[in-house]
């Protein structure tokens, strides 16, 4: 007598949700007699899946007739698969028996895992914005996919990034999954135009990865060099005062004049010319009247880049002796 | 060859506990249930109860439930039949047989346990 | 739960005797009946199932018969090594049971 075996021939199936799942089992005899029956799981909790005796079993159909006299074939069809369903699938064959027919021989389990796509990655930058040479994290996630394996990858600018660490949650068994990676990039300070990209590559996805972005626009802040000239003197005593302001990002910026420590005009970055890089350059100019100078004049310029602390550019405006000898008279 | 050895003679005191072991060879342990039986002295044969080998779901006779607790070990072939809370009406041989299809086709020596103050 | 009742309780025969033990059950077992031979400080051997079958390697001499409420165990023609306690027990629905033993005795 050829001893009985029970073929499960598929030890992992993907089943997408609202899909049929088909467990395939044969045995290799028809002795002893009895039924096969379908559990899901193992031990004394286990759960009741399909038994052609008794029972309802509304979702399940048979692949083939069992109640033909020489049938081996003990397969079964389940529709309309829900997360739930997840779980280990035994065939189970029983001898007959009194009062209960008595459990002879397991397969070795089919387990059927849900089939979901992950959702589109969602990348992240820092809360606030860095310099160039500071390092900032962007943190990308993804979740609702199954099986659990899933391969993430970063990029900057379409170069693979290698410091990255990457968690798939829950360690354990799940209906699904999902994934949180946190890169560390060094900004430079052309950066502006620069793209962060989180890639997730999943059986789902029949090789055509998802991707998820960043511009790294919107965690750089890269300060601006300052520079300050002063025009020859033109006729009617007056002298051309040039600030400018290069290589900034972003492109809030406020600039206030200050003569001798006070305020004399505040102003808001407007017409701005833009870097092939990204960032912004602005000038600011001051006209300013020395006639009614009698002493030299210290003109402060206060450049306030992005909330930041205030950068000052100091410029002394000498008063010839001649208009400190003409104002002196006049006082006296 | 096949057989079902089981563990030897006890004497507990009222209110114990008693594990009594009974380890399989010579055949496929899975295959079987197996029961327990048992026999005071004099007296008839009682059923006690059964596990399945393979998920180790139990069945208890009404009379001995929560009282008894049965477990196996694949990984020996040994079954197990814990009685607890002992009294002197417990005093009995303790057998665990094999069940066929309906029928106990193979038993252990038996154990005798004398439950005594 | 299903009663078994054997009768007699015990008898006595010698040697070469035809002995017949019956059991009735309480409700209808159908054929889910076996009996088993014990003698003293020994555990039970089985050597009749499902009313009427015979167990490998028990002698002719023991044969079954019945079905549904009453069944005989019939030792033809009785051996000295026959003298035993005989039950018979049913398997058709939980719990098991047993009937209260049959004693027999040499005459």
């Known amino acids: 007598e050829e001893e009985l075996q029970m073929i499960q021939p598929e030890k992992l199936l993907l089943v997408a949700v609202g899909e049929s799942a088909t467990l395939n089992c044969t045995v290799t005899s028809l002795l002893p007699v009895g039924p096969v029956l379908w559990f899901r799981g193992v031990g004394p909790g286990r759960e009741l899946i399909y038994n052609q005796k008794e029972g309802h079993f509304p979702r399940v159909t048979t692949v083939s007739d069992l109640t033909k006299r020489n049938n081996m074939d003990f397969s079964i069809r389940i529709s309309s698969i829900t997360p739930a369903d997840a779980g280990t699938y035994y065939c189970v064959k029983f001898r007959k028996g009194s009062p209960e027919n008595v459990e002879f021989k397991s397969g070795p389990g089919t387990e059927m895992a849900l089939r979901a796509k992950p959702s589109a990655p969602v990348v992240s930058g820092p809360a606030a914005r860095a310099t160039p040479e500071h390092t900032v994290s962007f943190t990308c996630k993804s979740h609702g996919f199954s099986p659990r394996d899933i391969t993430l990858k970063w990029f900057k600018n379409g170069n693979e990034l290698s410091d990255f660490q990457t968690n798939v949650d829950p360690a354990g068994q799940s209906v699904s999954y999902s994934i949180r990676s946190t890169a560390r990039v060094v900004l430079a300070p052309w950066d502006v135009r620069s793209q962060v990209t989180c890639e997730v590559a999943h059986v789902t996805l029949q090789g055509d990865p998802l991707r998820g972005t960043a511009n790294l626009s919107e965690a750089i802040r890269v300060p601006p060099t300052l520079e300050v000239t002063q025009q020859p003197m033109r006729a009617g005593n007056q002298v051309n005062i040039t600030y400018q302001v290069r290589n900034f990002y972003p492109q809030n910026l406020q600039l206030t004049w200050l003569e001798n420590g006070n305020v004399c005009r505040t102003e808001t970055a407007s017409t701005l010319t833009e870097n092939k890089d990204g960032t912004y350059n602005w000038t600011s100019w001051l006209l300013v009247n020395t006639s009614d100078q009698r002493d030299d004049v210290v003109l402060t310029c206060q450049v306030k880049h992005d909330g930041q602390l205030a950068v000052n550019k100091s410029l002394v405006l000498e008063v010839s002796a001649h208009q400190k000898d003409q104002s002196s008279d006049a006082t006296h | 060859q096949v057989q079902l050895v089981q563990s030897g003679a006890e004497v507990k005191k009222p209110g114990a506990s008693v594990k009594v072991s009974c380890k399989a060879s010579g055949y496929t342990f899975t295959s079987y249930y197996m029961h327990w039986v048992r026999q005071a002295p004099g007296q008839g044969l009682e059923w006690m109860g059964r596990i399945n080998p393979n998920s180790g779901g139990t069945k208890y006779a009404q009379k001995f439930q929560g009282r008894v607790t049965m477990t196996r070990d694949t990984s020996t072939s040994t079954v197990y039949m814990e009685l607890s809370s002992l009294r002197s009406e417990d005093t009995a041989v303790y057998y665990c047989a094999r069940l066929g299809s309906a029928y106990f086709d193979l038993w252990g020596r038996g154990t005798l346990v004398t439950v005594s103050s | 739960d299903i009663q078994m009742t054997q009768s007699p309780s015990s008898l006595s025969a010698s040697v070469g005797d035809r002995v017949t033990i019956t059991c009735r059950a309480s409700?209808?077992?159908?054929?889910?009946l076996a009996w088993y031979q014990q003698k003293p400080g020994k555990a039970p051997k089985l050597l009749i199932y499902?009313?009427?079958t015979l167990e490998s390697g028990v002698p002719s001499r023991f044969s079954g018969s019945g079905s549904g409420t009453d069944f005989t165990l019939t030792i033809s023609s009785l051996q000295p090594e026959d003298f035993a306690t005989y039950y018979c027990q049913q398997a058709n629905s939980f719990p098991i049971t047993f009937g209260q033993g049959t004693r027999l005795e040499i005459k």
């Open positions: 409700q209808s077992v159908d054929t889910w």
């Open positions: 499902e009313a009427s």
